[in-house]
């Protein structure tokens, strides 16, 4: 058992049929030493009488906010929450297993930037009686401030017959130099809690690994004289850590119609202009990479043709 | 340690395409280490990620550009020299912070030469012949330190009596690409950025 | 099965003009791009030009420009390149090509042999 | 126009060993550039296209890499039918133009 906050506590359990569970020891909070009971949630029944109450907690039926009284008045609460191990792995039943770049990745993240901020996002289909804490580091060992705010319902999908929310949080990195030459993972640890359960995930990345730029900005589009050609420019999303000789893009264009299988004209460049060929009801889309580090690449920004 | 005195190619900044070639071909080379070594804790994950320039050189400090020395993150971690004009470009009067940076960086490609030599005289000897390094990669670590053009002390290729652990080294060998990669990176960002200059 | 089957060898005078057919099968003939590459004998590949055969719309090489017309037919999809003006050093293997991308080729024709000859 | 420079023009190489073949553009033309077997008698075949993305049906033996101006075919082990012409294409601007070829024989 480990305290996750002031009087909220979480019981570790291996999680099998007839597993005996762990012995827990509660101590009220008070100076008096008798006259005290034990309840637990809303129910009246004494579990029993002392300062210390030992119980057995072996399933969901045993967790919650165990309080201890004298007289009729409220003397402390503790909130004992489980955590699921089964065969020998941590349960992971509140977030749902967002499948990309590879199994089991529940959080994900992105930075716009090298600026030492990011946003990290999961999924999950409950509804109600959830909450969740982020913390973060540079390093575990020795770790670097990295400070979060908190998480917040960020988007609502239907899948299916499921919903599906989304939550996120953004994160600073206290002293981040976006020049620097990163050794050392930021690490993000996210406690959930879904009524009594409790659960914890994390992720480990280099934010040069996390980096999906901004689309391009300003998309303008010249024809050129007596040619099918048209000559289309852009400039770097004001998101982008500069100077932009230094934190350089390089730029897919593409022109496109409605459907991802009819044809197309395609080139890259680092320059932010490109000439195309433009084709009536197709449209123009430009995207950016780091040009140095090949991470993401960023939505497509895009116009008309016409 | 004397500064070498850098005089850097007359016409079109030089060093820029050197860089380049540098970055596709140290990613090229990590590329192929780890479908090779795929057996072998070989990805940004499993890897430690060791600086083998660490306290030796400080090319992200020296070459820092002029926008970010205001960012006092960037400045923080030891005394710090950083270009604040000129470029690598015809001009003989190559500024001194300017020189620093440039020489910081040849200094980071001969350390990674040498080990990297070190590395491929073991990996000849493996009997599995697993991998070696692209002879291309050494090559193009060649061209930019002469492009460069820095005189500079000649550092001993390490010899060692002992038999060589093939596992240890292409692990090291891993490790070396993975940092290797980081600095041309930066490598390249500070060419452009002269180059823009 | 995408395939381009092109028309058979011709000999042309020099000053004469040349057609050769490029017949599409297999997919949708206006969802493609369809360019022209000649192959002159012992040498590389130059580039000719392309079609839009949904739209008609071509692009031309300038070395080519005014002496080269690049025509589709949908309906029996079909595409055309015309070579006028012809001197001997045109003779070469004429290759019908295309692509739903436009700056690269995927799929060849056979190939036509052009000989100019007087 | 842009000019692709392919080097050597002709590569001896051993069945077995890897082969490298090297294209030079006269500009700088990003990863706008495509690879094509050849063989006698016979239409070019796409291996690679914008530098390094392979293309489905072509074995992993191939592969691309480069950017800017200069880029490299790499055949990792030559097999028996690899013995042909490779041909670089640029596609960076119109008109779209050709290496001279480099000819892979047996050595």
């Known amino acids: 058992i480990w305290e996750l906050k002031k009087d909220v506590y979480v019981v570790e359990l291996d999680w099998y049929p007839d597993a005996p569970g762990e012995m827990v020891v509660l101590t009220c909070d008070t100076p008096e030493e008798d006259g005290i009971t034990w309840t637990l949630d809303q129910s009246s029944e004494v579990l029993g009488s002392g300062k210390t109450l030992t119980i057995q907690v072996k399933e969901f039926g045993d967790a919650g906010q165990y309080t201890c009284h004298k007289g009729g008045e409220v003397l402390s609460h503790s909130l004992l929450l489980l955590h699921k191990k089964e065969d020998g792995i941590w349960s992971t039943d509140i977030l749902k297993d967002q499948k990309e770049p590879k199994n089991k990745t529940f959080l994900r993240c992105e930075a716009k930037n090298y600026s030492g901020r990011f946003t990290c996002w999961w999924l999950t289909t409950i509804s109600t009686d959830l909450t969740f804490s982020v913390k973060s580091s540079r390093g575990s060992s020795d770790p670097q401030g990295v400070t979060c705010g908190a998480a917040t319902l960020s988007a609502e999908r239907v899948r299916g017959d499921n919903k599906e929310y989304e939550y996120s949080v953004e994160c600073q990195e206290d002293s981040a130099c976006p020049a620097a030459e990163e050794s050392l993972p930021i690490e993000v640890m996210v406690d959930a809690v879904h009524k009594l359960k409790y659960e914890n995930y994390t992720s480990s990345f280099f934010i040069r690994d996390i980096i999906k730029p901004d689309p391009p900005k300003n998309l303008q589009l010249k024809p050129l004289k007596n040619s099918r050609q048209v000559e289309v420019s852009w400039e770097y999303p004001d998101t982008w850590s500069t100077p932009h000789s230094y934190f350089s893009l390089t730029f897919c264009v593409q022109v496109q119609g409605k459907s991802k299988r009819e044809k197309k004209d395609r080139v890259f460049t680092d320059k932010t202009s490109a000439t195309v060929i433009c084709r009536k009801n197709a449209s123009i889309s430009v995207r950016a990479q780091d040009r140095y580090y090949s991470s993401s690449w960023s939505e497509w920004a895009s116009v008309p043709c016409s | 340690r004397n500064l070498p005195v850098a005089t850097p190619d007359p016409g079109m900044f030089p060093c820029l395409h050197h860089s380049q070639n540098l970055l596709r071909a140290v990613s090229n080379m990590l590329q192929k280490a780890r479908q090779t070594l795929e057996f072998y804790p070989c990805t940004s994950e499993e890897i430690d990620h060791e600086d083998i320039t660490k306290d030796k050189t400080s090319t992200v400090e020296a070459c820092l550009p002029l926008e970010l020395t205001k960012n006092e993150s960037c400045l923080n971690s030891r005394e710090t020299s950083f270009i604040t004009n000129g470029s690598c470009l015809a001009s003989r009067k190559t500024s001194f912070m300017m020189a620093l940076c440039l020489s910081s960086i040849y200094e980071d490609l001969k350390m990674y030469q040498v080990e990297f030599k070190t590395m491929n005289a073991k990996l000849l000897m493996d009997p599995k012949r697993q991998i070696f390094l692209d002879q291309n990669m050494l090559a193009v670590i060649d061209e930019l330190m002469q492009a460069l053009n820095f005189n500079s002390e000649t550092v001993p290729q390490k010899s060692s009596l002992e038999e060589p652990d093939f596992y240890k080294t292409k692990i090291k060998l891993c490790i070396l690409l993975h940092a290797f990669r980081i600095r041309a990176v930066t490598i390249d960002r500070v060419m452009s950025y002269l180059n823009a200059s | 099965q995408v395939q381009l089957v092109q028309s058979g060898a011709e000999v042309k005078k020099p000053g004469s003009s040349v057609k050769v057919s490029c017949k599409a099968s297999g997919g949708t003939f206006s969802d493609y791009y369809l360019h022209w590459v000649r192959q002159a004998p012992g040498q590389g590949l130059e580039w000719m030009g392309w079609?839009?055969?949904?739209?008609?719309?071509?692009e031309y090489a300038p070395k080519f420009q005014g002496r080269v017309t690049i025509t589709a037919d949908e309906s029996t999809s079909t595409a055309y390149m015309e070579l006028s003006s012809l001197r001997s050093e045109d003779t070469a293997v004429y290759y019908c090509?295309?692509?739903?991308?436009?700056?690269?080729?995927?799929?060849w024709g056979q190939g036509t042999l052009v000989t100019v000859s007087s | 126009d842009i000019v692709m420079t392919q080097s050597p023009l002709s590569l001896p190489v051993t069945p077995g060993e890897p082969a490298s073949i090297s294209c030079r553009a006269s500009q700088s033309i990003s990863i706008n550039l495509h690879w094509y077997q050849q063989k006698p008698g016979q239409a070019p075949r796409l291996l690679i296209a914008?530098?390094?993305q392979s293309i489905s049906g072509v074995p992993s033996r191939f592969s691309g890499s480069g950017s800017g101006t200069d880029f490299t075919l790499t055949i990792s082990s030559l097999q028996p039918e690899d013995f042909a012409t490779y041909l670089c294409q640029q596609s960076n601007s119109f008109p779209l133009t050709f290496g001279q070829g480099t000819k892979v024989e047996i050595k």
């Open positions: 090509a295309r692509n739903k991308e436009l700056r690269y080729i995927d799929v």
């Open positions: 914008f530098a390094s």
């Open positions: 079609i839009d055969p949904e739209n008609g719309d071509t």
